[in-house]
């Protein structure tokens, strides 16, 4: 019967079993519900939309890695519908904290405001280089300089949504 | 059946917050976004942001970052808004709506801002 | 932010007759379109999405087409129980923007 059937299976009425969902393609959303023995009759799948990605299967879209807003990094591979963005080195005025487990994010740039002496990134940096930083046009993300409380409960910003 | 309930009229004062909820049901929670639009009196439509229920993970209109703050609470399948300092323009209709495709919206919300 | 522009802002038509909303955006959102319709009781419903793709339960007199900037909503067989504003929305880019919305009244 369909209560048995498993997250991402429908009960098949004509063959009597469960049946597993179609899934997405790479770069594709799920539309509607399925799972959990039930279809919506016009299941089917989405393209992504702005600024997110997914791998396919019944993933919902998630957002590209915010480099520059987020990460304090250079952008080196912009993503696309198919996949997330690939951080590069820090920013100008920004600099990467050695020998420090990665945390849930991955690595993150600090301001260079806040590095010890001779810390080799800064050398140079001027104080005003991590004052101003891009964000997202239109839209924004919660930085872990803005909201570090919400960094630990994976809350409030989106490097990984 | 997909089903998103928001909860009642609000009727605030200025200056003053108000939160208010969206509940889902007939899916499974955390496999979908939830978006916030607001409807004001000349019936235009803006997006406010969206939330993530299995991360967190939140994106802001600009416009609202400063207004809006969206949570969730994945043991209730509820969505909340919290709109803070509130003014005359924040009197609204304010609505949920799921991701994939925005096929199903909540009932809206209406938000009274007066002294 | 990519500004949507509606147009008509009102039209009325009678039963029976043949329908186009048009929807401009400022920049090409690469079919990244979906048509909302909201009924005077302020029920909103989704009716078109990715452009042309009709959504569960909408009656095939609704269709949706368009590319670049330029996009449509056309409703033949014009019935009473279409009366209601009708709104456009991308979602190319972030903030997604809306249309200012077309009031469709009957003659």
């Known amino acids: 019967e369909y209560s048995n059937c498993g997250e991402n299976e429908y009960y098949n009425q004509t063959t009597g079993l469960c049946q597993e969902c179609p899934p997405c393609g790479p770069g594709e959303e799920p539309y509607l519900s399925c799972g959990y023995g039930t279809k919506d009759e016009d299941y089917g799948c989405v393209p992504c939309p702005a600024e997110k990605f997914s791998k396919g299967g019944y993933q919902i879209c998630r957002r590209h890695k915010d480099c520059e807003g987020f990460f304090r990094a250079t952008v080196l591979t912009p993503g696309d519908m198919e996949n997330d963005a690939e951080c590069g080195p820090c920013l100008p005025g920004y600099y990467m904290l050695e020998n420090r487990p990665r945390n849930i994010y991955g690595m993150v740039c600090y301001s260079c405001l806040l590095a010890p002496p001779n810390t080799k990134e800064c050398v140079g940096a001027t104080s005003g280089a991590s004052a101003n930083f891009p964000g997202t046009s239109g839209s924004s993300t919660l930085s872990p300089f803005q909201h570090a409380h919400k960094e630990l409960s994976g809350q409030g910003h989106l490097a990984t949504a | 059946e997909v089903q998103l309930e928001e909860s009642g009229p609000e009727l605030v004062k200025p200056g003053a917050s108000v939160r208010i909820s969206c509940k889902a049901s007939?899916?499974?929670?955390?496999?979908?976004?939830m978006h916030w639009v607001k409807q004001g009196p000349e019936k235009s439509l803006e997006w406010i942001g969206e939330?993530?229920?299995?991360?967190?993970?939140?994106i802001y209109n600009q416009k609202f970052e400063a207004k809006a703050t969206l949570t969730v609470d994945i043991s209730s399948s509820t969505t909340y808004m919290q709109l803070k300092s509130l003014t005359s323009e924040d009197s609204a209709v304010y609505y949920c709506?799921?991701?994939?495709?925005?096929?199903?919206w909540g009932q809206g919300t209406l938000v009274t801002v007066s002294a | 932010d990519i500004v949507m522009t509606q147009s008509p802002s009102s039209l009325s038509a009678s039963l029976g007759d043949r329908v186009t909303i048009s929807c401009s955006a400022s920049?090409?959102?690469?079919?990244?379109l979906n048509w909302f319709q909201q009924k005077p009781d302020g029920t909103i419903k989704l009716l078109i999405f990715?452009?042309?793709s009709l959504h569960s339960g909408v009656p095939s007199r609704f269709s949706g087409s368009g590319s670049g900037t330029d996009y449509y909503l056309t409703i033949s067989n014009l019935e009473t129980e279409d009366v209601a504003i009708y709104y456009c929305q991308q979602y190319s880019k972030l903030p997604y923007t809306f249309g200012g919305g077309t009031k469709l009244e009957i003659k």
């Open positions: 709506t799921r991701s994939g495709g925005f096929p199903y």
């Open positions: 007939g899916y499974s929670f955390t496999d979908y976004w």
């Open positions: 939330i993530n229920p299995s991360t967190g993970g939140i």
């Open positions: 990715y452009t042309s």
């Open positions: 920049q090409g959102i690469s079919n990244y």
